[in-house]
């Protein structure tokens, strides 16, 4: 039985050009986690595997790195960056657990403004 | 240098057994998850049974499950297929190919071939 | 168990030509989704990985693409050498599956 849950960083905002840490968490569960997948809507971004570490996709090399933790760094964000980012967590013996992530990047003046205006 | 090297191939009538073996070296071999592909004589690839690295969880194609057993000795960097009640449509070159991040088969080899025939 | 369709069966081309094989999975395989070159009596090469990655000392001739169910190995320049069978593979979930094979002969 999968008694696991994953808790995400959830809906986060970003500057254009700037960097953010996607992070996941795996708890309840005293499963043994074997490999995480990062992807983006339906592109493999990375993997971090217990036994062969981590293996950046070639194609996001330059703006993606590893860590921190089981988490991913995601720099020179652009516009495009926008979207749905999923960790998804293999273990032993309970399967698959997957986490949900919505980046929205902002353009620098919108995402200043914004911060001006959030409620702590 | 990555090396896999099948052997344990022949033939044998149906309804008999084989022993697969392929050696790897040339990389940490309990780091990886690791495959058996088959291909009939002038037919595609089939994938038939494949081994994960950490857990050795095992999994298994629907045309050999219950038939044939995966398994892997890592202090021999070895792989195994144990074949049971072989019937003449398992005749084919037998594969084994390393699964990094069980994501892709990067190397192969040789293959060795089985052949179940009366 | 997903299905890997692979068009066309077979194709010819000439030395120099740009080739461009189909592989459509029966549902969404997001990225998981790996091309190999087989030749007669060789064991299958991996070229492409993950969709769109080249494999460590594959010619930059060939390419990948797509996500979801529709992806495309290209081979920009036809080579002498690059005559063989090609298979998509998806990596998505067990069973893993391969497509039916291209097989590229010469004109």
């Known amino acids: 039985m999968m008694t696991g849950t994953i808790e995400t960083t959830g809906n986060i905002s970003a500057e254009k050009g700037g960097s953010i840490i996607l992070q996941c968490h795996l708890s309840s569960t005293t499963a043994q986690v074997t490999q995480v997948n990062w992807e983006q809507q339906d592109q493999l971004l990375a993997i971090c595997n217990a036994d062969l570490g981590w293996h950046i996709s070639p194609s996001f090399k330059d703006r993606v790195a590893p860590g921190p933790g089981l988490g991913l760094t995601l720099q020179s964000l652009t516009v495009n960056d926008t979207g749905e980012y999923f960790c998804i967590y293999h273990t032993y013996p309970d399967g698959t657990y997957t986490g949900r992530i919505f980046l929205e990047v902002l353009e620098s003046s919108v995402a200043e403004h914004g911060a001006r205006f959030q409620i702590p | 240098e990555v090396q896999l090297l099948e052997s344990g191939g022949g033939l044998v009538q149906p309804g008999g057994s084989l022993r697969l073996s392929c050696a790897a070296s040339?990389?940490?071999?309990?780091?990886?998850?690791m495959n058996w592909v088959r291909q009939a004589p002038g037919k595609g690839l089939e994938w038939v049974a494949g081994i994960k690295s950490s857990s050795g969880n095992k999994y298994y194609a629907d045309s050999v499950k219950g038939r044939f057993t995966i398994s892997r000795d890592n202090s021999k960097n070895t792989l195994y297929l144990q074949m049971n009640s072989l019937r003449a449509e398992d005749t084919a070159v037998y594969y084994c190919?390393?699964?990094?991040?069980?994501?892709?088969?990067?190397?192969w080899g040789q293959g060795t071939l089985v052949t179940v025939s009366s | 168990d997903i299905q890997m369709t692979q068009s066309p069966s077979s194709l010819s081309a000439s030395v120099g030509d740009r080739v461009t094989i189909t592989c459509r999975a029966s549902q969404s395989i997001s990225s998981y989704l790996n091309w190999y070159q087989q030749k007669p009596g060789k064991a299958p090469k991996l070229l492409i990985y993950a969709a769109s990655s080249l494999q460590s000392g594959v010619p930059s001739r060939f390419s990948g693409s797509g996500s979801g169910t529709d992806f495309t190995l290209t081979i920009s320049s036809l080579q002498p050498e690059d005559f063989a069978t090609y298979y998509c593979q998806q990596s998505y979930s067990t069973p893993l599956t391969f497509g039916g094979g291209t097989k590229v002969e010469i004109k």
């Open positions: 040339g990389f940490t071999f309990s780091s990886y998850s």
């Open positions: 190919a390393r699964g990094p991040y069980d994501v892709w088969m990067d190397y």
